[in-house]
């Protein structure tokens, strides 16, 4: 039967009359920076071109005493996972391999840099279609390696990397910590994080998504028809590189930001058991397992958003944390979160010509996170409207007053150490959805955007009694752009978006004290773009056919036949 | 994912007032920084990536590398330029004694220097 990992990334249902059959990644070139590979393996023969690039640390003559098959093992397996004839994700993709890891699977930051430079020069000399670079390696945090990845990404290359197998925060490793790189953690057949004793998949805010990475059957360098199972975040990254190749082949014009948003959007949500992650990392780690889109089109109408967490601010009184969106994304809202509940809110501010989300720690606080909601909104014109703290007991309010601008998010920031001691009524006047309302001692920031066909609405869910978590979700067809809490009292730890749900966290009921200040309302701002929907319908009207799943239906048969043919 | 994670080690070597004869002082108020891997066993001391400021041309990179070699030689140190970067980042890869870091950080156009370190198959 089809290997579990290929089944897992195949969408469960699809409508065959909806879309064009893609070509399995044939328009895309995938560069692999890894060990040497066995290019004559029948899984990858004719699909992988071994470049003359080699930059590896010395091995004390190991290649002499170590079997060549072992030297080729890691790279051969990954090439097979990406584009293998029988067990590969993107069977049509062509690959180029660069040797940056020696027979022990060890390389250097400098060798990897020179490899990335080689790819950039090749791209300039002979421009081809979309490029995906797979980096199935990790070292300690490296400013220079992250910078090189950023430059290559800004040159239009999609970089996919392993989160690392250190059962640790991926932000401590490179290239996993580079914001421009798509960083992939590993899950098993039960959709649980891969673990092996003291080691296991990395996690945290620097991971974009997870993918199958345990007991993955692929090409073995033992012989040209051999297969073997391997495990690790490299295998997970190879799956995502394959999915990216499929998506880019179907839509070659996709930008990195669009691709990342699609990968997130089409992932399986909330299937990973978060209890495996350290408690402080659970909220930061995306609960996403990669999957192929159910069709090549049909996604264009969607307003795509993702949540980006900042690094922790640290505990000092004036500490701040900043969350940023990618260059092609719009910051549509900004929220903050503190485990201790001691924070001074958040604000959207301009930095280097772009809006960023800044959260403020409070005296005695253990630190805060800033949480940015980053969206793809073509032709958007967004601005922040601020109202200073109000004198009136009704609280501070601000609205979007420009013609055609809609409210996408609300933030509030305060200078007083504890808002909880001041409890004014917080009311939202009826019929004024384009308004942010907050505490009278807080300044309120409204994110107001104008974009073709953009419409937004406010959804609230209030709970009168103290509750550790209050959620409100946007319905089908709408995308969560803003997430905030009312009122901004001290027992509210913060608010953040998880997929299409706004989550407001409050302090443990037992520590809250009186129930009178227990009432919490989660406020979601849900948006959609009629403009994108129209454009997509026009596009779909001119296409017909089947889609990505057909390749996988065929693949199931191929694998089955291969399995029986050889055994 | 952030560029400015503070979890790696950063050593800022401040410029001394007695400038080296051959070195041009960097632009006022900018101090080149030195970075190394926080995981000690993964460090590769003796090999350094010298990253130059963004708009530095290849010819300037080569000139800076030669200047470092000349200044090191005057102090009795052998250095070897292993690679000159251009296309992605301006800079060069140099094999040298860690004793020369302070000197290297004072070179014109230097943004930061990073000690080489290991990466591993995952």
């Amino acid at each position: 039967s089809i290997p579990w990992n290929l089944e897992r990334i195949t969408p469960p249902r699809y409508r065959a009359d909806e879309y064009q059959p893609p070509d399995g990644g044939s328009l895309v070139e995938v560069y692999l920076l890894d060990t040497s590979i066995q290019s004559d393996h029948r899984e990858i023969e004719g699909r992988v071109m071994v470049t003359d690039f080699e930059n590896v640390p010395e091995e004390d003559g190991t290649r002499f005493h170590r079997q060549a098959s072992k030297c080729d093992s890691h790279g051969t397996h990954l090439a097979g996972v990406v584009s293998g004839r029988d067990a590969g994700v993107a069977k049509g993709a062509s690959m180029r391999s660069l040797r940056v890891l020696n027979c022990q699977g060890k390389g250097t930051v400098s060798g990897t840099l020179i490899g990335l430079e080689f790819i950039r020069k090749s791209q300039l000399v002979q421009p081809v279609g979309p490029l995906v670079v797979l980096l199935p390696l990790a070292g300690g945090y490296s400013r220079v390696l992250n910078a090189a990845c950023q430059r290559l990404a800004r040159a239009g290359v999609v970089l996919v990397t392993a989160a690392g197998n250190f059962r640790d925060d991926a932000c401590l490793y490179s290239p996993a910590s580079a914001p421009e790189v798509i960083t992939v953690g590993a899950t098993n057949a039960q959709d649980q994080p891969v673990t092996l004793g003291t080691l296991g998949t990395n996690f945290g805010r620097c991971v974009d998504l997870f993918a199958p990475g345990e007991d993955i059957i692929g090409a073995s360098s033992d012989c040209s028809t051999c297969f073997v199972s391997q495990s690790g975040t490299s295998q997970a990254a190879a799956h995502v590189a394959g999915i990216a190749a499929m998506m880019l082949s179907a839509e070659p014009e996709l930008t990195l930001a669009e691709l990342r948003q699609r990968l997130i959007h089409f992932s399986a949500k909330d299937v990973i058991n978060e209890a495996w992650f350290p408690e402080d990392q659970r909220v930061l780690t995306p609960n996403l397992v990669a999957a192929l889109p159910p069709s090549t089109h049909g996604a264009g109408w969607q307003l795509f958003c993702r949540t980006v967490w900042s690094a922790h601010s640290g505990p000092t009184r004036m500490a701040t944390a900043v969350a940023r969106c990618a260059p092609d994304e719009e910051l549509l809202s900004c929220s903050s979160f503190s485990r201790s509940g001691k924070r001074r809110g958040e604000r959207m501010e301009a930095q280097g010509g772009k809006l960023v989300c800044r959260a403020h720690n409070a005296f005695g606080g253990e630190g805060v996170y800033a949480i940015a909601r980053c969206c793809l909104l073509p032709q958007a014109n967004c601005s922040v409207h601020t109202a200073p703290p109000a004198e009136a007991s009704m609280g501070t309010r601000v609205h979007c007053h420009q013609q055609g601008h809609v409210l996408t998010g609300c933030s509030s920031h305060w200078e007083v150490e504890d808002l909880g001691t001041h409890k004014p009524p917080v009311l939202r006047p009826r019929g004024q959805p384009n308004q942010c309302v907050g505490h009278r001692e807080a300044s309120i920031h409204a994110s107001c955007c104008h974009a073709p066909g953009l419409e937004c609405k406010v959804k609230e869910h209030g709970i009168p009694a103290p509750q550790e978590q209050v959620t409100v979700a946007c319905e089908e067809g709408w995308t969560l752009t803003g997430c905030s809490a009312l009122p901004g009292t001290s027992h509210v730890l913060g608010a953040y978006a998880v997929d299409n749900t706004c989550v407001v966290r409050s302090r443990d009921v037992s520590t809250t004290g009186s129930t009178s200040e227990g009432a919490v309302t989660a406020v979601a701002i849900c948006c959609r773009s009629r403009h994108l929907a129209q454009a997509s319908q026009e596009l779909q009207g001119s296409t017909s056919g089947s889609g990505l799943n057909d390749i996988f239906e065929a693949q199931k048969i191929e694998w089955h036949e291969h399995h029986h043919h050889h055994h | 994912q952030e560029d400015e994670d503070g979890d790696y080690e950063e050593l800022v070597l401040a410029l001394r007032s007695e400038e080296d004869g051959l070195a041009e002082a960097p632009e006022h108020g900018t101090t080149a920084t030195f970075h190394r891997c926080a995981k000690d066993p993964w460090r590769l001391p003796g090999t350094y990536v010298v990253v130059l400021k963004e708009e530095t041309h290849l010819s300037q990179s080569e000139r800076t590398a030669r200047r470092l070699q000349a200044q090191a030689a005057r102090r009795g140190y052998l250095t070897k330029i292993l690679h000159v970067f251009h296309g992605l980042l301006p800079g060069f890869l140099v094999k040298m004694s860690g004793d020369l870091l302070e000197l290297a950080l004072k070179l014109p156009h230097v943004d930061y220097i990073e000690e080489d370190s290991s990466v591993f198959a995952q």
């Epitope: 060890k106 012989c223 073997v228 199972s229 975040t233 | 591993f120």
Partner: antibody, heavy 121, light 107 residues
Framework: QVQLVQSGAEVKKPGASVKVSCKAS????????IHWVRQAPGQGLEWMGY????????KFNQKFKDRVTMTRDTSISTAYMELSRLRSDDTAVYYC??????????????WGQGTTVTVSS | DIVMTQSPSSLSASVGDRVTITCKAS??????VVWYQQKPGKSPKLLIY???NRYTGVPSRFSGSGSGTDFTLTISSLQPEDFATYFC?????????FGGGTKVEIK
């Protein structure tokens, strides 16, 4: 659960051959190499070689190259090790073991219970 | 072939003792060393992989260290169930080779 179950003890005369079986269950048999390791009474462990069950690829310790044969039957998820021209110093417990690869690290994570082969005239 | 020399070949210790077993390779095997525990009449059981990584279910009192040619297995506080024979094995080069074993006995 994942396990390897080996055939029972054998007593053989010098010059004869012995064929030990190793039945795998609880995992995809063709996904992992099966290695054979022996242990003479009161002695250490000695690696004999392995088979990649997804094909018929084998690799042997030179010491046994001329006398050992490794095969597999994927329909019953079983690997076999045959040692010919037995000598008295081949008396040992023979183990099969599954090799796992994680992040470029290699190790035997599952072992059979062992098969005692006694060579005596 | 790479020779793995294990020492001591046997040692006597008491419950609670700290025990250290060493393994020396005849040439550089990097970190490509595994440690197994074997009890009489039983199959070997994986303890440490890649020189220093504890395998799933192995108690934290077991730790491994070393790289290149010198490797160490340490049991920080010996427990009654730890009396057994311990083997190191290199996988850097074929043929795989094992150390001669260290028998840990009750004093």
């Amino acid at each position: 659960q994942v396990q390897l179950v080996q055939s029972g003890a054998e007593v053989k005369k010098p010059g004869a051959s012995v064929k030990v079986s190793c039945k795998a269950s609880g995992y995809t048999f063709t996904g992992y190499t099966i290695h054979w390791v022996r242990q003479a009474p009161g002695q250490g462990l000695e690696w004999m070689g392995y088979i990649n069950p997804s094909s018929t690829y084998t690799k042997f310790n030179q010491k046994f190259k001329d006398r050992v044969t490794m095969t597999r039957d994927t329909s019953i998820s079983t690997a076999y090790m045959e040692l010919s021209r037995l000598r008295s110093d081949d008396t040992a417990v023979y183990y099969c073991a599954r090799e796992r690869i994680y992040s470029n690290y290699w190790f035997f994570d599952v072992w059979g219970q062992g098969t005692t082969v006694t060579v005596s005239s | 072939d790479i020779v793995m020399t294990q020492s001591p070949s046997s040692l006597s210790a008491s419950v609670g003792d700290r025990v250290t077993i060493t393994c020396k390779a005849s040439q550089n095997v990097y970190w490509e060393v595994v440690w197994y525990q074997q009890k009489p009449g039983k199959s070997p059981k994986l303890l440490i992989y890649s020189a220093s990584n504890r395998y799933t279910g192995v108690p934290s009192r077991f730790s491994g260290s070393g790289s290149g040619t010198d490797f160490t297995l340490t049991i920080s506080s010996l427990q009654p169930e730890d009396f057994a024979t311990y083997f190191c094995q290199q996988y850097s080069s074929y043929p795989y080779t094992f150390g001669g074993g260290t028998k840990v006995e009750i004093k």
